[in-house]
Interface confidence: low
């Protein structure tokens, strides 16, 4: 707490500028009025203030606006942001996408900091969900913003937004986030032609089902090993050998190099070995022939 | 891309003036301060002086007080550094460095401007 | 002149973790984020570190930035020949604004 001082004669502060930088912290503390930061506070982020003045600044704002800043206060907080606290940030009402920008582009090239994640999260909860326009700005200054929303969270998501998401955004996904997000994906580019749709789909295939993989098996989409290992295993699982084979097109000899890793691992042990066989790609581990093949999970929900 | 270009060596005598500029590309010139900062051969870096390109408020390092003047023409994006009463320990190369908002770091430099101070 | 001490040269072979110190006071370590320069012979100085331990995109994840109190100091593992150069400290003085410290020669054995 800076300590209730009188302004020396003379340092009264008509606006916010350059001088202020040249005065210690109590004389900040007594000399420049609240309401004239609040009015110039784009002004501050271009002086050259120490971080020990900007405490002060804060403090006086602090004072001000103990239930919150304004918006129009917020847009112009710049490094003054980094000043703030998570409970500081929850006590806001950021509706507009330009002052979200504007906070983000001072924490840019920084770590999601807990300020951040608290600023992003009343944000999106003002808006209700999770527009095209919000997640455009949160994946460009963030790609694993996506990643690192809960379930539930991304239940939110309308499929209109999907439209906005990079491969890269899903890099750090789980099967539950793509088993939630994949649907919205098939919705959205529902209208696309083969091969356009390929190319949009497959970041979210982590998610898809074994229906769907069959769908495009029949589709010549040669899907790349590194989208085949991100396949979720129950839905690989079912897949015949020539539906494999058709999936991957060319890429079906990489199946080799993956053979002692999951979903391939598992699959080979559900394969005929004759039909594995047939790949010529040497891979062992198929059921002998001549053995019965149980499903078991149609056993179990006959009984 | 942002860029700082400065002009080239420079050779003077001792009691003479050097202006030194440093003409940015890539940003909005305006929207940084422009510092200098100065290397003499095999020593450290030693900062010189700050100023605001959209209002042209200066300042300057104490040593420096009194023969430094730092300008801007912001119609081409250059900013200026003159030094005057130049002695032999001013040989130096001298640096443009853009400041980087909310903190003292520079972000950016121009790439040197040698001056030599020999009779 | 110089307000911040660093010690004239550090070496390490490749692979090596080396570290530099940068030493000040209250007026400036002390009260204001610390920033790093590596200046590769003949080139301009470029920013390594920002705010004690902030890495400008493109700076390897192999250098990292520390402050404790009025020190601060610079961490560089996995060493590599093209990691040798000149090191400097720098922060903002209350009393004479930016300030460097004298610089550190890393030499890559």
């Known amino acids: 707490e800076v300590e209730k001082t009188a302004c020396p004669s003379g340092k009264k502060a008509r606006e916010i500028d350059e001088s202020l930088i040249f005065y210690k912290k109590w004389e900040l503390e007594a000399c420049v009025d609240a309401a004239l930061l609040a009015t110039q506070m784009d002004r501050v982020n271009a002086i050259p203030f120490t971080y020990e003045q900007l405490d002060v600044l804060k403090h006086k704002l602090d004072e001000l606006y103990p239930q919150g800043y304004p918006e129009s206060v917020i847009q112009h907080l710049g490094y003054l942001f980094l000043k703030m606290s998570p409970e500081d940030i929850r006590k806001w009402n950021v509706t507009s996408l330009e002052t979200l920008k504007a906070l983000l582009e001072v924490n840019k090239g920084h770590e999601m900091s807990p300020q951040v994640a608290t600023l992003i999260d009343r944000f999106v909860k003002g808006r209700g969900q999770l527009d095209k326009d919000t997640l455009d700005t949160l994946t460009a200054f963030y790609p694993g913003y996506l990643c690192s929303l809960s379930p539930e969270e991304l239940s939110s998501v309308p499929p209109s937004s999907i439209w906005a998401v990079r491969p890269q955004d899903l890099d750090t996904c789980d099967p539950r986030q793509l088993d939630v997000l994949y649907p919205k994906a098939r919705l959205a580019f529902q209208n696309m032609n083969g091969s356009e749709y390929f190319v949009k789909i497959q970041s979210f295939l982590g998610g898809a089902p074994t229906e769907d993989l069959k769908a495009l098996s029949q589709q010549n989409v040669s899907m790349d090993l590194a989208t085949f290992m991100k396949l979720r295993t129950d839905a690989v699982l079912p897949l015949t050998v020539a539906e494999v084979q058709k999936l991957l097109g060319p890429h079906v000899e990489g199946l080799k190099a993956e053979e002692r890793h999951r979903p391939v691992r598992d699959w080979i042990l559900r394969q005929r070995q004759d039909d594995l066989d047939t790949l010529g790609l040497g891979l062992q581990g198929g059921i002998p022939n001549g053995y019965l093949v149980l499903d078991l999970s149609m056993q179990e929900a006959l009984s | 891309q942002v860029q700082l270009v400065q002009s080239g060596a420079e050779v003077k005598k001792p009691g003479a003036s050097v202006k030194v500029s440093c003409k940015a590309s890539g940003y909005t010139f305006t929207g940084n301060y422009i510092n200098w900062v100065r290397q003499a051969p095999g020593q450290g870096l030693e900062w010189m002086g700050i100023?605001?390109?959209?209002?042209?408020?200066?300042l300057y390092a104490q040593k420096f007080q009194g023969r430094v003047t730092m300008t801007r023409d912001t119609s081409i994006s250059t900013a200026y550094m003159e030094l005057s009463s130049l002695r032999s320990e001013d040989t130096a190369v001298y640096y443009c460095a853009r400041w980087h908002h909310g903190t003292w770091i520079f972000d950016y430099w121009g790439q040197g401007t040698l001056v030599t101070v020999s009779s | 002149d110089i307000v911040l001490t660093q010690p004239p040269s550090v070496s390490g072979a490749p692979g090596q973790r080396v570290t530099i110190s940068c030493s000040g006071s209250?007026?400036?370590?002390?009260?204001?984020?610390v920033s790093w320069y590596q200046q590769l012979p003949g080139t301009a100085p470029k920013l390594l570190i920002y705010n004690d331990n902030q890495r400008p995109s493109g700076v390897p994840d192999r250098f990292s930035g520390s402050k404790s109190g009025t020190s601060a100091s610079l961490a560089i593992t996995g060493l590599q020949s093209e990691d040798e150069a000149d090191y400097y400290c720098?922060?903002?003085?209350?009393?004479?604004?930016?300030?460097f410290g004298g610089g550190t020669k890393l030499t890559v054995l």
């Open positions: 720098s922060t903002y003085d209350r009393r004479t604004f930016s300030v």
């Open positions: 209250s007026s400036n370590i002390g009260s204001n984020y």
């Open positions: 100023i605001n390109p959209t209002k042209g408020w200066t």
